[in-house]
Amino acid sequence: HTAAQDNCTCPTNKMTVCSPDGPGGRCQCRALGSGMAVDCSTLTSKCLLLKARMSAPKNARTLVRPSEHALVDNDGLYDPDCDPEGRFKARQCNQTSVCWCVNSVGVRRTDKGDLSLRCDELVRTHHILIDLRHRPTAGAFNHSDLDAELRRLFRERYRLHPKFVAAVHYEQPTIQIELRQNTSQKAAGDVDIGDAAYYFERDIKGESLFQGRGGLDLRVRGEPLQVERTLIYYLDEIPPKFSMKRLTA
């Protein structure tokens, strides 16, 4: 697993412990919580990051949904089960044997049930809408400059292939970033849009996951872009299955 060999650290994930005891005596970085080795040349999966963060304070929120099938992360933090590749297992359960199904970004997509609940497959989140509101500025940002800066950010900081940034919309003070990535589009080695969105979310909150790097300093033509509110909506390839009671609540 690639890491900075000289001092054996993980540039892309500060929630690791690194030691020169990997194959061939190379540096190996293990995610806190799970102990799984991570590839430090790319982003760590959201599941392993959540597992590492499980002791952090709960931060539940309730958001307005932009479409009937969009999901938001209302449940806050939980200690997830990750598969051997570091992805979320389709079924998640807590210590009181309450279970639910999640999508590929770990957001609940069914009502909660008991241990008999079946989640046949991990449903892919193929469309993520990141809704930002920036702090007041002297004037509106130039849309094309803003678009270019955000695309550069996702390409360079999060290593997300440009084709997965579908659009950047802007109506001052609201910025919307659309990420799209179907199962068929995602090749081996491609960063997952869910992981990129999670790193971006943590950066925006001033909780960068990168090792030793300064926090996110977003500027458009030298003008600071300061975000005061972030909402993230998730759309799955198969619509979620909630009871009518929840949908009308």
Partner: antibody, heavy 115, light 107 residues
Framework: QVQLVQSGAEVKKPGASVKVSCKAS????????INWVRQAPGQGLEWMGN????????NYNKKFKDRVTMTRDTSTSTVYMELSSLRSEDTAVYYC????????WGQGTLVTVSS | EIVLTQSPATLSLSPGERATLSCRAS??????IHWYQQKPGQAPRLLIY???ESISGIPARFSGSGSGTDFTLTISSLEPEDFAVYYC?????????FGQGTKLEIK
């Protein structure tokens, strides 16, 4: 050469605690995990947990989580494993071992729990 | 927790014969498996690292193979000092776990 030297045998009463030490030498102490593994008489090996000496990050097997504490003293390159609320089934040889592959082992410390 | 199952529990062979010991993981673990030899009254000794990597000072007759869930330790030609208990362990994720051991005895 790399060496892990453990403290001597202990005899304890049920309900008591035991603290076993493991002194490391011959390598950069803060760079490698130290694991604790135990072996009951005639039984197999059981991983208890580990500690990363650089920052004291420790991780415990759930079976022992409420009873085990692992600490380190970087000034003496020593790791400690304390097991509390001892019962007869804790009678075992306790080993410290370096790294994720347990490439070097201490000689073992026999802990006998008997009333 | 990843469960490692070793087989056979006991293997009876004669010096000069080839020994094949198996370790199977309950889930895929890449090559994060290690093999140890333990003799009575001694601490275990690492033989093979990360499924197939040889260890300095360990005789060349010891070799390892496998990836995913199935792993093998092979001793090409048994020497009298090889009769001992052999364990596999996984370092894929916490908690690290060991197999129950294979006792290699003289036939």
């Amino acid at each position: 050469q790399v060496q892990l030297v453990q403290s001597g045998a202990e005899v304890k009463k049920p309900g008591a605690s035991v603290k076993v030490s493991c002194k490391a030498s011959g390598y950069t102490f803060t760079s490698y995990w130290i694991n604790w593994v135990r072996q009951a008489p005639g039984q197999g090996l059981e991983w208890m947990g580990n500690i990363f000496p650089s920052d004291s990050y420790s991780n415990y097997n759930k079976k022992f989580k409420d009873r085990v504490t692992m600490t380190r003293d970087t000034s003496t390159s020593t790791v400690y494993m304390e097991l509390s609320s001892l019962r007869s089934e804790d009678t075992a040889v306790y080993y410290c071992a370096r790294g994720s592959g347990f490439d070097y082992w201490g000689q073992g410390t026999l802990v006998t729990v008997s009333s | 927790e990843i469960v490692l199952t070793q087989s056979p529990a006991t293997l009876s062979l004669s010096p000069g014969e080839r020994a094949t010991l198996s370790c199977r993981a309950s889930q895929t673990i890449g090559t994060s498996i290690h093999w140890y030899q333990q003799k009575p009254g001694q601490a275990p000794r690492l033989l093979i690292y990360y499924a197939s990597e040889s260890i300095s000072g360990i005789p060349a007759r010891f070799s390892g193979s496998g990836s995913g869930t199935d792993f093998t330790l092979t001793i090409s030609s048994l020497e009298p000092e090889d009769f001992a208990v052999y364990y596999c362990s996984q370092s894929f994720s916490w908690p690290f776990t060991f197999g129950q051991g294979t006792k290699l005895e003289i036939k």
